[in-house]
């Protein structure tokens, strides 16, 4: 079985009421602009076949994709939340930079690729959906990595 190394975040990262609130406010505002409620990006399919020890590594991949392909391109929208939340999530991503798994991660890459494909297929509305699910990303990252 793959072994996760450095795939941990300190609980204190998620115990900051102000930035937690801003993350949830950003998600709420974006979800109001999301007219595709049938699709969920962060859900059971994303974690299918992924063991407990691999969850953080998977969420690291999702976080990095969300930052690079969604939040940075959309950084001028949903202010003032975006300018506060993006640096916070970028710091979490940086703290997970040494998170790797030894062995085969194809099943994880496959799951993450499906999420990426869904976002890309939906175009800008896919990006809005991803921002609207930042609350789920935040909570899932916390649950997977602490």
């Amino acid at each position: 079985a793959p072994i996760s190394s450095h795939c941990r975040l300190d609980k204190s990262n998620f115990q900051q009421p102000y930035i937690t609130n801003r993350t949830f406010m950003l998600a709420k505002e974006a979800s109001l602009a999301d007219n595709n409620t049938d699709v969920r990006l962060i859900g059971e399919k994303l974690f299918h076949g992924v063991s407990m020890s691999e969850r953080c590594y998977l969420m690291k991949q999702v976080l990095n994709f969300t930052l690079e392909e969604v939040l940075f391109p959309q950084s001028d929208r949903f202010q003032p939340y975006m300018q506060e939340v993006v640096p916070f999530l970028a710091r979490l991503s940086n703290r997970l930079s040494t998170c790797h798994i030894e062995g085969d991660d194809l099943h994880i890459q496959r799951n993450v690729q499906k999420l990426k494909d869904t976002v890309k297929k939906l175009g800008e509305s896919g990006e809005i959906k991803a921002i609207g699910e930042l609350d789920l990303l935040f909570m899932s990252l916390r649950n997977a990595c602490i």
């Epitope: 079985a1 609980k11 998620f14 962060i42 859900g43 059971e44 974690f47 299918h48 076949g49 992924v50 063991s51 407990m52 020890s53 969850r55 789920l136 909570m139 899932s140 916390r142 649950n143 997977a144 602490i146």
Partner: antibody, heavy 119, light 112 residues
Amino acid sequence: EVQLVESGGGLVQPGGSLRLSCAVSGFSLSSYAMIWVRQAPGKGLEWIGIIDIDGSTYYASWAKGRFTISRDSSKNTVYLQMNSLRAEDTAVYYCARDRFVGVDIFDPWGQGTLVTVSS
Amino acid sequence: AVVLTQSPSSLSASVGDRVTITCQASEDIYTNLAWYQQKPGKAPKLLIYWASTLASGVPSRFSGSGSGTDFTLTISSLQPEDFATYYCQAVVYGNSADSRYTFGGGTKVEIK
């Protein structure tokens, strides 16, 4: 259709052992963790332990040492081995699928199998 | 380990009533809370997860709310098939796995 069917319950004497089975269909054990939960007569639900996708096992502190969870993926079956049984282990034992959706949720559950520990 | 305290432990209600059940956690569990329904002689059934997300196939008269330590399950208009026992369940990450999953004591909803 996803189904979980427990078996192996029955009457056992104090100090005895029993192995419960949970046969699953409609999904693969290589894709989902599985849990065992018990419920004493007229009481609430009590988590026993979990076997993860990679075969790792975790137990409630009270269950460590006496209870062992294993699986046979070729038979799509999860087992709960119970040793040194006591009267207070009398309960309905349930297996359930652990679905991680960002948080662990237990769905669906088997119908349960009754274990009675008595002399 | 987190302790979940449900209240009331039992209640009597009539068809059509609005029913509210609370679950209090001894520590912050964020929104890592689920609700299950159990009918006599049957297995528990998932109703709600993430504190407020309705599980597939669950009627919209069920709703959940709360975060942190205080949670609520509401049945907006009680139906005959809703008479059952309801359990809250928490998942606490970051601690030892031996205390990760905890259930509340249950709330029995009976016919008045």
